[in-house]
């Protein structure tokens, strides 16, 4: 058993048909020695009497609120929460697994540049009972602080007769230079509990694996004279790191109709503009990558040929 | 000539291009050793993170954009008495440290080679001959090198008596590409900044 | 299986002009662009022109501009090279190559012998 | 218009070597570069896209590499079938030019 955070304990259980179980002492946190009694969550049945109060637990109906009182006064409560264990495994059914970019990923991360500041997102179909707590720092062993928000839910989605939930929190390095060669990653710890239920997610990555610029911005369309083609431009996004010419870009052009089946015109450029074959109900895109090291590519940035 | 000047012709920073061979010929070795060692931890997650030039070199911050040294963060780093020190400091604003950022680059590819060197010549001996270093990555290294046109003091190439432990030199040869990737990356960075400058 | 099925050789004098045809199977003809390319004996390949076959659109090589002519017809899924003014260098192999993709070329033709002689 | 120049224009090799061409555009052009394989009296077959991405069916032995102006295609162990003439060609910027090709040749 350990503390969560102030009277919430998390029990640890291997959980299999008849294991034992663990045996936890529960204290009044009291001056007082005598006619103390303890109850759970909202029932009314004494389960003991004295200071402290022993335990057996083996499933959810042990765990829940324990208060204890004297003479109908409320002195303290511990609440129990279970973190389960099966075949040597924590549980994971809170969280649904992303499978992006691999299996077992419940919690997947994105910066949008090199300033330490990144966003984490998760998904579950729970949809009440639930908390999360989010903690970060740079390294384990000697950590370094990043500071994080609290976790609100971002969305909400349809798939198929279920209800998904999309919850998100925003972290910061709290000194974090831009340019700087990361060489202990970031951890990313996220408890959960949903009623009774406690579970523990991590992540751990570098800044730079998980960098995903913004779609560039600003794109125009110049048609040549006497040519099919047209001279598309833009910008580097606002949230991109500074200097451009230190933190370069490059760029993926695209000419395509509304299907993907349809045939396209595709070019890469280091440069802020291209030349592209345009064709009538087709849309030109743009998006980025970092020049150097190559992460996620951003969102396209469209404009209709027309 | 003795060290490369930006102007205003891209094609008149002989580094630039050197370093974005560099960076193409690190990475290409890194996706053949993650290959070829594919039953070796040789990914990101699995590697430890060691720079070999920690401590003796200060590329990313004698190389630090100008934009970037009102950044507390990137001045506050293990070299800041170095990068304020000695004949540059007058011209620290306008300069951009140029020689001190390129001469730490120049130690940095000294120090990548030599290593390199060494562990090609114990990959050589391995019986199952599973992994050696691409010619072109050295000969890039060696091309950019050049390009920056140093005279500094020839480091001999390490060379070992005992019997080569083939599996750690080959875990060693995945923390070394890593490492020297990513060194790749700020090198090209930084030439890509000058040649803009 | 998508492939392109080209003419027969030709053999043409100076001056004259030359059709030389190209059927699409085994995809939807204007899903593709269809693209030609020369090579001349013992020599490299040389692109002359691209056409979109569902708007007739046409783009060529400016050193082929005025000399060749790129149509499709959609009813038969058939693209079409026309040579004019023939003379002994554009002796040569024609390929059609075609794409979803503009600017790369994924099948290819057997090729067109064209051999100008008087 | 862009000028693609490969080097060698021709090289000798045995079955099982490694044999690598190169490919250098008068200018930048990012990753737009393919390369094809041409066997006599045959069409070419485009072998790799975007300078590096492989194209599905063909053998993993061939390799692209490259950005900006220098490309080379890499062919890691030689097989009798690949004894053929190599070209690249340019994408960037239309008229789309291709390299003067490379003979692969039995030693």
């Known amino acids: 058993i350990w503390e969560l955070k102030k009277d919430v304990y998390v029990v640890e259980l291997d959980w299999y048909p008849d294991a034992p179980g663990e045996m936890v002492v529960l204290t009044c946190d009291t001056p007082e020695e005598d006619g103390i009694t303890w109850t759970l969550d909202q029932s009314s049945e004494v389960l003991g009497s004295g200071k402290t109060l022993t335990i057996q637990v083996k499933e959810f109906g042990d765990a829940g609120q324990y208060t204890c009182h004297k003479g109908g006064e409320v002195l303290s409560h511990s609440l129990l929460l279970l973190h389960k264990k099966e075949d040597g495994i924590w549980s994971t059914d809170i969280l649904k697994d992303q499978k992006e970019p691999k299996n077992k990923t419940f919690l997947r991360c994105e910066a949008k540049n090199y300033s330490g500041r990144f966003t984490c997102w998760w998904l579950t179909t729970i949809s009440t009972d639930l908390t999360f707590s989010v903690k970060s720092s740079r390294g384990s062993s000697d950590p370094q602080g990043v500071t994080c928000g609290a976790a609100t839910l971002s969305a909400e989605r349809v798939r198929g007769d279920n209800k998904e939930y999309e919850y998100s929190v925003e972290c910061q390095e709290d000194s974090a230079c831009p340019a700087a060669e990361e060489s202990l990653p970031i951890e990313v710890m996220v408890d959960a509990v949903h009623k009774l239920k406690y579970e523990n997610y991590t992540s751990s990555f570098f800044i730079r694996d998980i960098i995903k610029p913004d779609p560039p911005k600003n794109l125009q369309l110049k048609p040549l004279k006497n040519s099919r083609q047209v001279e598309v431009s833009w910008e580097y996004p606002d949230t991109w790191s500074t200097p451009h010419s230190y933190f370069s870009l490059t760029f993926c052009v695209q000419v395509q109709g509304k299907s993907k089946r349809e045939k396209k015109d595709r070019v890469f450029t280091d440069k802020t503009s291209a030349t592209v074959i345009c064709r009538k109900n087709a849309s030109i895109s743009v998006r980025a990558q970092d020049r150097y090291y190559s992460s996620s590519w951003s969102e396209w940035a469209s404009v209709p040929c027309s | 000539r003795n060290l490369p000047v930006a102007t205003p012709d891209p094609g008149m920073f002989p580094c630039l291009h050197h370093s974005q061979n560099l960076l193409r010929a690190v990475s290409n070795m890194l996706q053949k050793a993650r290959q070829t060692l594919e039953f070796y931890p040789c990914t990101s997650e699995e590697i430890d993170h060691e720079d070999i030039t920690k401590d003796k070199t200060s590329t990313v911050e004698a190389c630090l954009p100008l934009e970037l040294t009102k950044n507390e963060s990137c001045l506050n780093s293990r070299e800041t008495s170095f990068i304020t020190n000695g004949s540059c400091l007058a011209s620290r604003k306008t300069s951009f440290m140029m020689a001190l950022c390129l001469s730490s680059i120049y130690e940095d590819l000294k120090m990548y080679q030599v290593e390199f060197k060494t562990m090609n010549a114990k990959l050589l001996m391995d019986p199952k001959r599973q992994i050696f270093l691409d010619q072109n990555m050295l000969a890039v290294i060696d091309e950019l090198m050049q390009a920056l046109n140093f005279n500094s003091e020839t480091v001999p190439q390490k060379s070992s008596l005992e019997e080569p432990d083939f599996y750690k030199t080959k875990i060693k040869l995945c923390i070394l590409l890593h490492a020297f990737r990513i060194r790749a990356v700020t090198i090209d960075r930084v030439m890509s900044y000058l040649n803009a400058s | 299986e998508v492939q392109l099925v080209q003419s027969g050789a030709e053999v043409k004098k100076p001056g004259a002009t030359v059709k030389i045809s190209c059927k699409a199977s085994g995809y939807t003809f204007s899903d593709y662009y269809l693209h030609w390319v020369r090579q001349r004996p013992e020599k490299g390949l040389e692109w002359m022109g691209w056409?979109?076959?569902?708007?007739?659109?046409?783009e060529y090589a400016p050193k082929f501009q005025g000399k060749v002519t790129i149509t499709a017809d959609t009813s038969t899924d058939t693209g079409y090279l026309e040579l004019s003014s023939l003379r002994s260098e554009d002796t040569a192999v024609y390929y059609c190559a075609a794409n979803k993709e503009l600017r790369y070329f994924d099948v290819w033709g057997q090729g067109t012998l064209v051999t100008v002689s008087s | 218009d862009i000028q693609m120049t490969q080097s060698p224009s021709s090289v000798s090799a045995s079955v099982g070597d490694r044999v690598t061409i190169t490919c250098r555009a008068s200018?930048?052009?990012?990753?737009?570069l393919h390369w094809y394989q041409q066997k006599p009296g045959k069409a070419p077959k485009l072998l790799i896209k975007?300078?590096?991405q492989s194209i599905s069916g063909v053998p993993s032995r061939f390799s692209g590499y490259g950005s900006g102006t220098d490309f080379s295609l890499t062919i890691n162990s030689l097989q009798p079938e690949d004894f053929a003439r190599y070209y690249c060609?340019?994408?960037?910027?239309?008229?789309?030019?291709f390299g003067g090709g490379t003979k692969v040749e039995i030693k």
């Open positions: 060609q340019q994408s960037n910027s239309f008229p789309l030019t």
């Open positions: 200018q930048s052009i990012s990753i737009n």
């Open positions: 975007f300078a590096s």
């Open positions: 056409i979109d076959p569902e708007n007739g659109d046409t």
